[in-house]
């Protein structure tokens, strides 16, 4: 199992939405996906989670975009705010 | 129903101040940017304000700048515009609005009037 | 602050016409320009978002178009209920920052 994300560093205007990359690789036929938020203090705050089997997710101000054909699970932030500075991280689980 | 609804206009002396009040129904409030827009008697649209979802981010105009004040009690779906040393140039019709999350005001008050004279 | 030039400020059209009002801005803006409509003593309700895409319920007679500094609203075939003023409004950067307006009239 694998996961990568490319991007490094992001850097977005308030109000904007910003898009998050994540590709991954599974020999699980069924898994999840899990996006978390870390606070400067390290710790790891859930943010959503994509089911392989499941529809985009959604909850509030965050979205998946889940191409699992092509193993990518994208995590857009809509309507950005300063809080939202953060290091972001995606997870693969069963 | 989504809706939002303005209160607290009136008249006011110059100098004088007003709080308004925007109550909103039918969306989860806290996942919105809210704003604040007048429009001046016959005149066109102005916007005044806007606070993040959250609150921690705020910006004005700067005909407001330091005498103006949004803020939001997201456990009470409710937006609010403090306005102190008013001035009579600040008399207009006073709408909340809702920003999506493309950047449109895609839900609007009804309005309050606010009526700035001696 | 970016400027937004309305065109024209006013206009006189009979049902049926195609019309078109135009938006020009100062600098440059992507797609973060909308449309709103507005009656006498009403607020203004939104018709196009993100320079060309039409909002829920807003009927298909309305189109939005442009990017950059240049933007046009057309309404394909007039109806009575399409007199009122209309706004652009650019979301791109603070302050936000609508047009002067342009009021559509019965000829």
């Known amino acids: 199992q694998k996961v990568t994300q490319a991007q490094s560093s992001v850097s977005m205007p308030v109000r904007k939405a910003v898009t998050l990359n994540c590709l991954y690789e599974t020999s699980w036929w069924s898994y999840y996906i899990f996006w978390y938020k870390q606070l400067p203090s390290k710790e790891m705050i859930f943010l959503i989670r994509q089911g392989s089997d499941e529809q985009n997710a959604k909850s509030g101000r965050y979205s998946v975009n889940f191409k699992k054909a092509a193993k990518s699970v994208a995590l857009t932030i809509s309507a950005l705010q300063l809080e939202d500075s953060a290091k972001y991280f995606c997870a693969l689980g069963e | 129903e989504v809706q939002l609804l303005e209160s607290g206009g009136g008249l006011v002396k110059p100098g004088g101040s007003l709080r308004l009040s925007c109550a909103a129904s039918?969306?989860?409030?806290?996942?919105?940017?809210m704003s604040w827009i007048r429009q001046a008697p016959g005149k066109g649209l102005e916007w005044v304000s806007y606070?993040?979802?959250?609150?921690?981010?705020?910006y004005y105009a700067d005909s407001v700048k330091g005498r103006f004040t949004i803020s939001r009690d997201n456990a009470k779906n409710s937006l609010y515009l403090q306005m102190n040393s008013l001035r009579a140039e600040d008399t207009a019709v006073y709408y909340c609005?809702?920003?999506?999350?493309?950047?449109?005001?895609?839900?609007w008050g009804r309005g309050t009037l606010v009526t700035v004279s001696s | 602050d970016i400027q937004m030039t309305q065109s024209p400020s006013s206009l006189s059209a009979s049902v049926g016409d195609r019309v078109t009002i135009t938006c020009r801005t100062s600098?440059?803006?992507?797609?973060?320009l909308n449309w709103y409509q507005q009656k006498p003593g009403k607020a203004p309700k939104l018709l196009i978002y993100?320079?060309?895409s039409l909002q829920s319920g807003v009927p298909s007679r309305f189109s939005g178009s442009g990017s950059g500094t240049d933007f046009t609203l057309t309404i394909s075939s007039l109806q009575p209920e399409d007199f009122a003023t209309y706004y652009c409004?650019?979301?791109?950067?603070?302050?936000?920052?609508f047009g002067g307006g342009t009021k559509l009239e019965i000829k």
């Open positions: 609005a809702r920003e999506n999350y493309l950047n449109a005001f895609d839900i």
């Open positions: 039918g969306f989860t409030f806290s996942d919105y940017y």
């Open positions: 606070i993040s979802s959250s609150g921690s981010t705020i």
């Open positions: 600098q440059s803006l992507s797609n973060y």
């Open positions: 993100a320079a060309s």
């Open positions: 409004q650019q979301s791109y950067s603070t302050p936000l920052t």
